[in-house]
Interface confidence: medium
């Protein structure tokens, strides 16, 4: 569907407000260090230009691609080389290489200050003084810290952010109203960012086929009454949407996502009975709701899969005729029957089936060769089931904080070369699987747990890719997307690791720890725990527990002391000495 002016087309489709918001997100995700004011200026210039193209699509430069227009605009930034170094070299390239170059320079862990939340009254005043600037700043700050955040979903977050301030800044107790809402948005936002980061990694590192396979499995679980042709159509459209967003084509992505939501709602009778409420909502809420909608009920009396995929004498003929369609149908049929399996498990089963057919269809007696293929699935299903059972038991026994600590120790021993902040962040998130998933009944535990772990381990993979330090991490991250979790689970203590030199400064604490929130205090203690394991990788659980218990008592004691700083200095020295003795350092 060719348009004379792509920028005019998108401006008209999306409307001025969404157009400006999406251009701001796009620019902030590319130039993550640029000041807010500079981005606003660029966005305003692009918007004014878009309006001239809406008025006359034949006007000068209106026929240029969005990448050309946006790239040219980004390359006008005066401080590009000083701020971004070699990224400035992108500007010497032509499209599409220039855009690819910008994409390669997106930084998953930009060196930006932590976002500190001002006092509620300060925020409410800023909101009332200039609502538009306040909301733009939110988009800018999230986008630059999360360069792969799903742009149309960020518009939904911004809408909720605005609603929270509109309601709470008029409330009698502003803080009681606002702070829980902001906490919820922050936590949901981090989760949304991480989920989208996995989708982009899947597309960019493993290709469209891998993403489509993931989408077939997930949508078949969610819409088990939909026919394969319907699921295939949704998968094709969803792949286009995410390819666009992950490629920085945010206007096209948002436009296509809206079209997909419209299609789903117009055809909900042939897709799912659970969509009715979602489809009554406005656009941003509708798209979000569809993305999160619960699985529909499975159709009654689905026939056994064995007849078509194992017992039939035509399996190899059918497979040879259209391999990906046949495998897609297998995945669809298996997934719609198994909402109790994780998507990654379903993909492992499909991969096993594919490998078996590749081998057996070249054998003398193919049917005899693949007759027992479903038996090969049993151990693949049991492995995550057993792992989840064991870890949920451990979580229920320890509680979240101590469960996180157990994982910190486990993962530090597996990959001690990884930076301490990354180990703390990833292990804390891995530990959240307990409270997130262990409360669910058996039938929901595996899809909750293993698919969540895939998201968290992808964080480890993208952070490690920026500064690779461990061949074992690289291997688990790059060999197979669906086997990342089993690969990390299978890692034992790294025997090649040379323990880190002891540095007393690492274990020196000050009175400022007493004013930290409980979460920040936990992070301090967990940072110390990782460092301990890096110094003494062979330390036993009992030794580490004893040291950590002493450390907790030390912090509690000194935070109650009259002269906190002196307490931390004197008692700290004793603690370090006692810990060294206990661990044999």
């Amino acid at each position: 569907d060719a348009h004379k002016s792509e920028v005019a087309h998108r401006f008209k489709d999306l409307g001025e407000e969404n157009f400006k918001a999406l251009v701001l997100i796009a620019f902030a995700q590319y130039l993550q260090q640029c000041p807010f004011e500079d981005h606003v200026k660029l966005v305003n210039e692009v918007t004014e230009f878009a309006k001239t193209c809406v008025a006359d699509e034949s006007a000068e430069n209106c026929d240029k691609s969005l990448h050309t227009l946006f790239g040219d605009k980004l390359c006008t930034v005066a401080t590009l080389r000083e701020t971004y170094g070699e990224m400035a070299d992108c500007c010497a390239k032509q499209e599409p290489e220039r855009n690819e170059c910008f994409l390669q320079h997106k930084d998953d862990n930009p060196n930006l200050p932590r976002l500190v939340r001002p006092e509620v009254d300060v925020m409410c005043t800023a909101f009332h003084d200039n609502e538009e600037t306040f909301l733009k700043k939110y988009l800018y700050e999230i986008a630059r810290r999360h360069p792969y955040f799903y742009a149309p979903e960020l518009l939904f977050f911004a809408k909720r952010y605005k609603a929270a301030f509109t309601e709470c800044c008029q409330a009698a107790d502003k803080a009681a109203c606002l702070l829980p809402k902001l906490d919820e948005l922050r936590d949901e936002g981090k989760a949304s960012s991480a989920k989208q980061r996995l989708k982009c990694a899947s597309l960019q590192k493993f290709g469209e086929r891998a993403f489509k396979a993931w989408a077939v499995a997930r949508l078949s679980q969610r819409f088990p009454k939909a026919e394969f042709a319907e699921v295939s159509k949704l998968v094709t459209d969803l792949t286009k949407v995410h390819t666009e967003c992950c490629h920085g084509d945010l206007l096209e992505c948002a436009d296509d996502r809206a079209d997909l939501a419209k299609y789903i709602c117009e055809n909900q009778d042939s897709i799912s009975s659970k969509l009715k409420e979602c489809c009554e909502k406005p656009l941003l809420e509708k798209s979000h709701c569809i993305a999160e909608v619960e699985n529909d009920e499975m159709p009654a009396d689905l026939p056994s899969l064995a007849a078509d995929f194992v017992e039939s004498k035509d399996v190899c003929k059918n497979y040879a005729e259209a391999k990906d369609v046949f495998l897609g149908m297998f995945l669809y049929e298996y997934a719609r029957r198994h909402p109790d399996y994780s998507v990654v498990l379903l993909l492992r089963l499909a991969k096993t089936y594919e490998t078996t057919l590749e081998k057996c269809c070249a054998a003398a007696d193919p049917h005899e060769c693949y007759a027992k293929v479903f038996d090969e699935f049993k151990p693949l299903v049991e492995e995550p089931q057993n792992l989840i059972k064991q870890n949920c038991e451990l979580f229920e026994q320890l509680g979240e904080y101590k469960f996180q600590n157990a994982l910190l120790v486990r993962y530090t021993k597996k990959v001690p070369q990884v930076s301490t902040p990354t180990l703390v962040e990833v292990s804390r998130n891995l530990g959240k699987v307990g409270s997130k998933c262990c409360k669910h009944p058996e039938a929901k535990r595996m899809p909750c747990a293993e698919d969540y772990l895939s998201v968290v381990l992808n964080q480890l993979c993208v952070l490690h890719e920026k500064t690779p330090v461990s061949d074992r991490v690289t291997k688990c991250c790059t060999e197979s997307l669906v086997n990342r979790r089993p690969c990390f689970s299978a890692l034992e203590v790294d025997e090649t690791y040379v323990p880190k030199e002891f540095n007393a400064e690492t274990f020196t604490f000050h009175a400022d720890i007493c004013t930290l929130s409980e979460k920040e205090r936990q992070i301090k203690k967990q940072t110390a725990l990782v460092e301990l394991v890096k110094h003494k990788p062979k330390a036993t659980k009992e030794q580490l527990k004893a040291v950590m218990d002493d450390f907790a008592a030390f912090v509690e004691k000194c935070c109650k002391a009259d002269d906190k700083e002196t307490c931390f200095a004197e008692e700290g020295k004793k603690l370090v000495a006692a810990s060294q003795a206990a661990l044999g350092l």
């Epitope: 026919e227 394969f228 042709a229 295939s232 159509k233 042939s270 026939p303 007849a307 078509d308 995929f309 039939s312 035509d314 003929k317 059918n318 040879a320 005729e321 259209a322 369609v325 046949f326 897609g328 149908m329 049929e333």
Partner: nanobody, 128 residues
Framework: QLQVVESGGGLVQAGGSLRLSCAAS????????MGWFRQAPEKEREFVAG?????????DYADSVEGRFTISRDNAKNTAYLQMNNLKPEDTAVYYC????????????????????WGHGTQVTVSS
């Protein structure tokens, strides 16, 4: 939504031949059994022929057309065909192509309820 479009109908003398085509809009068409049905004026729609998916697929014919009609499919072109030879006046009807939603290995059903996607039909008139 999967679109189905028939073509190739027309007026033919008794004893003559016609070849009907059925084009599907999606590649996933190859994963389904498909069938031809017909409806003569003042009569119920009836099954004519069916074919299951992929190469070497199972075929099925109504007794009234067995030996005269041949159903085939070209998955590369997302198209199915009905070759009609030795046509009779009683073959006059609107011919509909339909795509099923059964499992891939399933035989093509004769029951209209097992077909989800239907074309608008193409008129075949056989004059005596």
């Amino acid at each position: 939504q999967l679109q189905v479009v028939e073509s190739g109908g027309g007026l033919v003398q008794a004893g003559g031949s016609l070849r009907l085509s059925c084009a599907a809009s999606e590649r996933t068409f190859v994963a389904y059994p498909m069938g031809w049905f017909r409806q003569a004026p003042e009569k119920e729609r009836e099954f004519v022929a069916g074919i299951s998916w992929f190469a070497g697929a199972t075929t099925d014919y109504a007794d009234s057309v067995e030996g005269r009609f041949t159903i085939s499919r070209d998955n590369a072109k997302n198209t199915a065909y009905l070759q009609m030879n030795n046509l009779k006046p009683e073959d006059t009807a609107v011919y509909y192509c339909a795509i099923s939603h059964q499992l891939p290995g399933g035989r093509p059903g004769r029951d209209m309820d097992s077909y989800s996607y239907w074309g608008h039909g193409t008129q075949v008139t056989v004059s005596s």
